[in-house]
Amino acid sequence: MNGSEYFVKIQSFLGGAPTEDLKALSQQNVSMDLATFMKLRTDAVLPLTVAEVQKLLGPHVEGLKAEERHRPVRDWILRQRQDDLDTLGLGLQGGIPNGYLVLDLSMQEALSGTPCLLGP
């Protein structure tokens, strides 16, 4: 069974998938469609890297631009380095500026919804 066939079989169960499952899926050429991606738990999407999202979505990654103001894409963008977002070739804006350090302060982030940044 190839990645696409596997994805069709598990698609209806993905809404509650944890980050670990999404990371594993990203290695299997599943080409998740945007509609499915938009239904994923925000907390599961946030830890994914740009490279992992690109592998997870395949050609569907082109649809991120139209969804950049909507959750979970909006919140995910805020967590990524702008340099990494730029590699997607979609003009996505709102990432962590180059030269900034991301402090993983869980309580701060839980309260504000955004990571704590330390300037250059």
């Epitope: 631009k65 997607l88 979609l90």
Partner: antibody, heavy 121, light 107 residues
């Protein structure tokens, strides 16, 4: 003003390869994927594939996957489409097209003028 | 892939006539369809996107409607300059597909 300027007409022999260029101007080249569409004489439009201009990752229509190569040169804001093992059925006008990402995956709002490729022995 | 079935493939109408072209998608594409006009030797020109949104500068005699799988493109009063081939495009999927085209001629 957004412009996509393509290379000139080509005449090729069967079995040869052709490389068509598309030079973009008037916008940030790395903010929009570039797509290629072809049109055989008297026929409809056929999507061939696209390429991420920032890191060069292409996605191809399955029909062309074994013969097409899409590349970009960021330094000159130019996209290229190379088609190999040409046959007479590849005689067509080849267009580059830029999408507008207003909704979903984006529709094409700007097109190159087209490059005519003739395959003849 | 999503197939787009466009009909008719050609039509002949008189100046002032109402002209209707349809596109049927092989699966639900919401409202993600665009319509293009192409004249001989020219690149396609975008007329309508998101089913019914007219591009700036496009005459109001052009309109579109539909959702899901069935879509309609209408020229309310055909003009001589409208002689062209018209195509629909689905962009609900990253692997874009066009309808087969409709050639519009004057009687």
């Amino acid at each position: 003003e957004v412009q996509l300027v393509q290379s000139g007409a080509e005449v090729k022999k069967p079995g040869a390869s052709v490389k068509v260029s598309c030079k973009a101007s008037g916008y940030t080249f790395t903010n929009y994927w570039m797509h290629w569409v072809r049109q055989a004489p008297g026929q409809g439009l056929e999507w061939m594939g696209n390429i991420n201009p920032s890191q060069g990752g292409p996605y191809y229509n399955e029909r062309f996957r074994s013969r097409v190569t899409m590349t970009v040169d960021k330094s000159t804001s130019t996209a290229y489409m190379e088609l190999s093992s040409l046959r007479s059925e590849d005689t067509a006008v080849y267009y580059c097209a830029r999408p507008y990402y207003g909704s979903s995956y984006g529709y094409f709002d700007y097109w190159g003028q087209g490059t005519t490729v003739t395959v003849s022995s | 892939d999503i197939q787009m079935t466009q009909s008719p493939s050609s039509l002949s109408a008189s100046v002032g006539d109402r002209v209707t072209i349809t596109c049927k998608a092989s699966q639900d594409i919401n409202k993600y369809i665009a319509w293009y006009q192409q004249k001989p030797g020219k690149a396609p020109k975008l007329l309508i996107h998101y089913t019914s949104e007219l591009q700036p500068g496009v005459p109001s005699r052009f309109s579109g409607s539909g959702s899901g799988t069935d879509f309609t493109f209408t020229i309310s009063s055909l003009q001589p300059e409208d002689i062209a081939t018209y195509y629909c495009l689905q962009y609900a999927n990253p692997l874009r597909t066009f309808g087969g085209g409709t050639k519009v001629e004057i009687k």
